[in-house]
């Protein structure tokens, strides 16, 4: 059963390592894949002394942990590298960190990347 599923056909693309990887630095990435597989967008970033440094953004292969996520939100507490994935065109344009712990109150830090 699949409820209210949003198709992902393209994602915001960014690669901080673009020169070494010989890719574009930024743009829109069309998401390809088998027709029976779902596609997602993702973002990875670091928080260096309070400054957000985007590592990569783009398309992400079919991954059940990305299903039904309309927003790109990292919820893991204090990760080394932040990661989120989502479904829907360009859903990785905005990403946020919203740590959810069992006892403490979560705080929201939305991020709008400006590569």
């Amino acid at each position: 059963a699949i409820l209210g599923r949003s198709e992902t056909q393209e994602c915001l693309f960014f690669n901080a390592n673009w020169e070494k990887d010989r890719t574009n630095q930024t743009g829109v990435e069309p998401c390809y894949g088998d027709k029976d597989k779902r596609r997602h967008c993702f973002a990875t970033w670091k928080n260096i002394s309070g400054s957000i440094e985007i590592v990569k953004q783009g398309c992400w292969l079919d991954d059940i942990n990305c299903y039904d996520r309309t927003d790109c939100v990292e919820k893991k507490d204090s990760p080394e590298v932040y990661f989120c994935c989502c479904e829907g065109n360009m859903c990785n344009e905005k990403f946020s960190y919203f740590p959810e712990m069992e006892v403490t109150q979560p705080t929201s830090n939305p991020v709008t990347p400006k590569p």
Epitope: A1, I2, L3, G4, L61, I64, Y67, R69, K76
Partner: antibody, heavy 118, light 111 residues
């Protein structure tokens, strides 16, 4: 520490029903897809069912479709497997597993035994 | 119906190297199937060894490594030890929510 604790197993007659529960702690339950995996006595592991973070998408192996229903209560940090019309071949240890990015099972419960016999 | 195949059994000498493989009937295994590997000893829950083809799970010794060999996923154990004697399962993620387990390989460490 991540903990998954299954309960609800037991002896049931063919055609009967059981509801398994998996109580999760030590991680943000509502941020993880979850699965049920079973193992018949002396046999290998078999994926049974998975559910997305919201519960909006559910998936089953062919042999349990229409008989088993997976669900979750994110406010109670609990995963469920409702098993109806049970058959002898459903006899197995049922494991609850947390699913992480790259769709792999990163944590497992200790399992609960379901025996279907008359 | 997708069938994932593993060697039913394998033997290795202590200190030796063994490579277990995981293929399927519908074509080649690639990284897009996120191959993962699990170890299980009798009466115990499975333990996660490798995910995303070649990433070791936390606490797993570097004697265990994952790869793609030809058209199959592979788990290599170097410097095999007595307590590596276990059942090993691979899992392929077929997409659209579906996971498929291999039949498992029973690994015997000789001696």
């Amino acid at each position: 520490e991540v903990q998954l604790l299954e309960s609800g197993g037991g002896l049931v007659q063919p055609g009967g029903s059981l509801r398994l529960s998996c109580a999760a702690s030590g991680f943000t339950f509502r941020n993880s897809a979850m699965s049920w995996v079973r193992q018949a006595p002396g046999k290998g592991l078999e994926w049974v069912s998975s559910i997305s973070v919201t519960g909006g998408s559910t998936y089953y192996t062919d042999s349990v479709k229409g008989r088993f229903t997976v669900s979750r209560d994110n406010s109670r940090n609990t995963l469920y497997l409702q098993m109806n019309s049970l058959r002898a071949e459903d006899t197995a240890v049922y494991y609850c597993a947390k699913v992480y990015y790259y769709s792999f099972f990163d944590y497992w419960g200790q399992g609960t035994l379901v025996t279907v016999s008359s | 119906q997708t069938v994932v195949t593993q060697e039913p059994s394998f033997s290795v000498s202590p200190g030796g190297t063994v490579t277990l493989t995981c293929g399927f009937n519908s074509g080649s295994v690639s990284t897009s199937y996120y191959p993962s590997w699990y170890q299980q000893t009798p009466g115990q829950a499975p333990r996660t060894l490798i995910y995303n083809t070649n990433t070791r799970s936390s606490g797993v010794p570097d004697r265990f490594s994952g790869s793609i060999l030809g058209n199959k996923a592979a788990l290599t154990i170097t410097g095999a030890q007595a307590d590596d004697e276990s059942d090993y399962y691979c899992v392929l993620y077929m997409g659209s929510g579906i996971h498929v387990f291999g039949g498992g390989t029973k690994l015997t460490v000789l001696g």
